[in-house]
């Protein structure tokens, strides 16, 4: 067991008397705070620069009679290289300069061994070795250089960033690891507070737009910052951040820009910059047209990029109309901080002028598109109708019409090229073509290069000038035995006009055909006449194929009619009805033939 | 070299004494402590007790008081043990060994005595 | 007295095994020393104060443990191992011996 010289002994421990003791630099120290005495501690200094090795303590077992019979072991914490022990006497030296910061305690343990038996003549026991510090190490910052941001315009004494500089020092004994921080350079813009590091601003109204970057220098000194205390320092890089107090302002009062008049909307006619001394969202402008006789004439977007105002043709211009245009144009700051409201408006506004200028603009048509009607019975040279359009610029120059060839490949139609007329130049045909598209350009006589074009839709009217027709070939059977008025076959016209009120057929026997027919045909008024028997029985040897001429007539003017045959065989049929043969000709009845029988 | 030499085996009838010897060569004799320990057949071992050739100081295991005694020979570096009222509880192979801390620690045995107690 | 427990009794191992062997006592000892002992042949020192290694001893031996328990290790097991290890303490007299552990190889 380890024990200090008895008159340092506390109470507490064990009854039995120990046998090792160990005396030397060990310290009853009471008076250091947060630190309970040890009896089994040595203390060393650190840093120790004498020639001699230094003496640590001695250790001491009550069997030693002093004879050499015990042996001193020493082990642990640099036994045998930092820590060396007299093997007879007990004696403990240090043999190297010892650093605290790289170590600050040692737990070493002894033994006393009886050389003669081999044998322990204690326990092993415990002790500490403490280095004691000495100021031997500055205070170094956890930053070699601090990075830091404060907003300009900021109240004295805000806080712009915490610096903390450590010591190795023993922070529980004297003042060796006590820092206190204080500024080298900076002032007097900054402060520093001494015990915390914390960096403020000491200036009223530090102005980023008059200077963005501040370098400061701290020093942090220990021995709470009496003489002789060591120090280390910082650079501090401080960038004032901007805030909004500045308005925008417009380097000029007026701006005048020129536009064609043929400028579509959306066309960009000149761009207008208000500067801010702030900057990012600070700086960002927003332009708007107050005022002014363009207001509904040109519109003013912001340029996310350059913050300018780019001022925009919103409707079509007319210089015939109004040649020049007057704006009122405030730039304004969106994001406004309310404690400098103080400082004015955060707007500016400027006049901007614009002037219409004109351009030679092709002839106008007084419609967009022109619908002609005309007879299909039109002679050569009938005019049609006409087309109007006009110079729009002031200089009203004449102008010549002509039709596009393209449209009008048969040359059908012509015009007039002064007034515009449009005649016919070949006889038409509605059933042959009811529309015809044609499109007249109009060229201004002066300049060629200037034309316009619009499309003519020509409608071609009905004349009666078509004869209805069966609307198929008709090829009917009668049976031998079929009786008097029997429906054999139902006809059909069709006529290519297009009356207005619509087809309105009669049909009849051709009158050659009237007077001793075997067959009559019966008008059934809805545009349809049916083919009937008009004798009971039919001899197919007597006659085997009879022709009907059928006259179809419309009811328009002038009216038209045509002859049509029917043929009719005699078939030899059975009891249903059903043709059996005809003279050895095979029948073919044709799609929706009626046998009538 | 260091050597401790013992004496022969011993055959020895019940109720008789025997003494074996131990002497020591390589070192000095006096500076280390004889110890003796017994080893039955088959068994462990057991520390008899210790002599400080110095000044024949003894110590006994209480055991074997009554039963060892030990005693030194400086002239002749010897060491003796002497075993009495033998049974055949005391058949066993007897050491002497010596511990030490000179440089670092030792300890040297002898080669071991065989006493044998029969009828 | 102080008993020393030693086990196991009789334990076997394979070359490069590590391996384990303790000995407990009846009651606190400052330290323990162990000694190797081969057939026919006196014991000899092996460690000393618990975890020193006497000379001449493998490093693959170590030596650790602290009031009533204690226990050697080799490692990685080699055959000249291969012998019965007793425990001792010199603490408290009568200085008394383990029962032995046995080593065999595999």
């Known amino acids: 067991t380890l024990s200090t010289p008895l008159s340092k002994r506390t109470s507490g421990f064990p009854a039995k008397k120990r046998a090792l003791e160990l005396s030397g630099n060990s310290k009853n120290e009471l008076s250091r705070s947060k630190r309970s005495w040890m009896w089994n501690q040595f203390f060393l200094l650190e840093e120790y620069t004498g020639s001699d090795y230094q003496y640590v303590g001695k250790l001491h077992s009550d069997q030693d009679r002093g004879d050499g019979s015990l042996k001193y072991i020493l082990s642990g914490d640099g036994a045998g290289d930092l820590f060396i022990i007299n093997e007879n006497t007990g004696d403990i030296q240090a043999t190297k300069r010892l650093d605290r910061e790289e170590k600050p305690v040692y737990i070493l343990r002894a033994q006393a061994i009886n050389r003669r038996t081999g044998r322990p003549v204690e326990p092993e026991s415990e002790f500490i070795i403490k280095i004691h510090d000495i100021n031997d190490n500055e205070p170094i910052f956890t930053k070699e250089v601090y990075t830091a941001t404060v907003p300009e315009m900021s109240d004295v004494g805000t806080f712009v960033v915490q610096v903390t500089a450590t010591d190795a020092d023993d922070p529980t004994y004297g003042n060796s690891a006590k820092v206190v921080y204080s500024i080298l350079q900076g002032q007097p813009y900054f402060s520093v507070e001494s015990e915390t590091g914390i960096i403020k601003t000491a200036l009223l109204n530090m102005d980023r737009e008059n200077r963005e970057q501040y370098q400061v220098v701290i020093q942090a000194k220990d021995m709470g910052g009496q003489m002789g205390g060591l120090s280390g320092t910082t650079t501090v890089n401080i960038t004032l951040t901007d805030v909004n107090d500045n308005p925008p302002r417009f380097p000029q009062s007026t701006y005048q820009f020129k536009t064609p008049e043929s400028s579509p909307p959306g066309t960009p006619i000149g761009r207008i910059k208000a500067s801010d001394a702030d900057v990012g969202e600070n700086a960002e402008i927003e332009y708007s047209i107050t005022d002014g006789e363009g207001l509904d004439m040109f519109d003013v977007i912001t340029d996310q990029e350059t913050q300018e105002g780019i001022i925009t043709v919103k409707k079509l211009l007319d210089f015939e109309k109004k040649k020049v245009y007057t704006l009122k144009v405030e730039a304004s700051n969106p994001h406004v901080e309310p404690r400098f409201l103080y400082l004015g408006p955060f707007k500016d506004s400027a006049t901007v002028r614009i002037v219409v200028e004109d351009v030679d603009e092709p002839p106008v048509f007084s419609k967009l598109a022109y619908i002609l009607q005309i007879r299909e019975d039109a002679q050569i040279n009938t005019t049609i109708g006409s087309v109007t359009a006009q110079d729009p610029d002031a200089a009203r120059n004449p102008v010549k019409y002509s039709v596009d060839r393209h449209t009008d490949m048969d040359r059908i139609f012509n015009i007039d090229s002064g007034n515009g007329s449009i005649f016919t130049s070949k006889l038409l045909d509605r059933e042959t073509l009811l529309w015809h598209n044609i499109t007249v350009i109009a060229t201004e006589i002066n300049n060629p290069k200037q034309s316009s074009r619009v499309p003519l839709y020509i409608k071609v009217l009905d004349v009666n000038d078509n004869a209805p027709e069966f609307a198929e070939f008709y090829e009917t059977f009668v049976c031998e035995k079929a009786k008097a008025d029997q429906l054999i076959q139902t006809l059909r016209a069709v006529d290519k006009d297009d009356p207005y009120s619509g087809h309105q057929f009669s049909f009849s026997l051709a009158p050659e055909a009237a007077s001793g027919s075997n067959f009559t045909i019966q008008d059934n008024k809805d545009n349809t006449a049916g083919i009937l028997t008009r004798k009971n029985g039919y001899n197919r040897h007597e006659m085997s194929t009879y022709l009907l001429p059928v006259v179809i007539s419309d009811n328009d003017y002038p009216v038209q009619s045509s002859t049509g045959t029917v043929t009719v065989r005699v078939c030899a049929c059975d009891h249903h009805g059903n043709m059996q043969s005809c003279h050895a000709e095979a029948l073919i009845h044709p799609t929706g033939l009626s046998t009538g029988a | 070299e260091v050597q401790l030499q013992q004496s022969g085996p011993e055959l020895v009838k019940p109720g008789a004494s025997v003494r074996i010897s131990c002497k020591a060569s390589g070192y000095t004799f006096t500076d280390y402590y004889m110890n003796w320990v017994k080893q039955s057949h088959g068994k462990s071992l057991e520390w008899i007790g210790d002599i400080d050739p110095n000044n024949a100081n003894t110590t006994y295991n209480q055991k074997f008081k009554g039963k060892a005694t030990l005693t030194v020979d400086k002239s002749s570096s010897t060491a003796y043990m002497e075993l009495r009222s033998l049974t055949s509880e005391d058949s066993a192979v007897y050491s002497c060994?010596?511990?030490?801390?000179?440089?670092?620690?030792?300890?040297?045995w002898g080669q071991g005595t065989l006493v044998t107690v029969s009828a | 007295q102080i008993v020393l427990t030693q086990s196991p009794a009789l334990m076997s191992a394979s070359p490069g095994e590590k391996v384990t062997m303790t000995c407990s006592a009846s009651s606190s000892v400052s330290y323990m020393y162990w000694y190797q002992q081969k057939p026919r042949s006196s014991p000899k020192p092996w460690i000393y104060?618990?975890?020193n290694l006497a000379s001449g001893v493998p490093a693959r031996f170590s030596g650790s443990g602290s009031g009533t328990s204690y226990s050697l290790t080799i490692s990685s097991m080699e055959a000249e191992d291969a012998a019965t290890y007793y425990c001792q303490q010199w603490s408290s007299n009568p200085f008394t011996f383990g029962s032995g552990t046995k080593l065999e190889i595999k």
């Open positions: 104060l618990t975890s």
């Open positions: 060994a010596s511990f030490g801390y000179d440089v670092e620690w030792f300890g040297y």
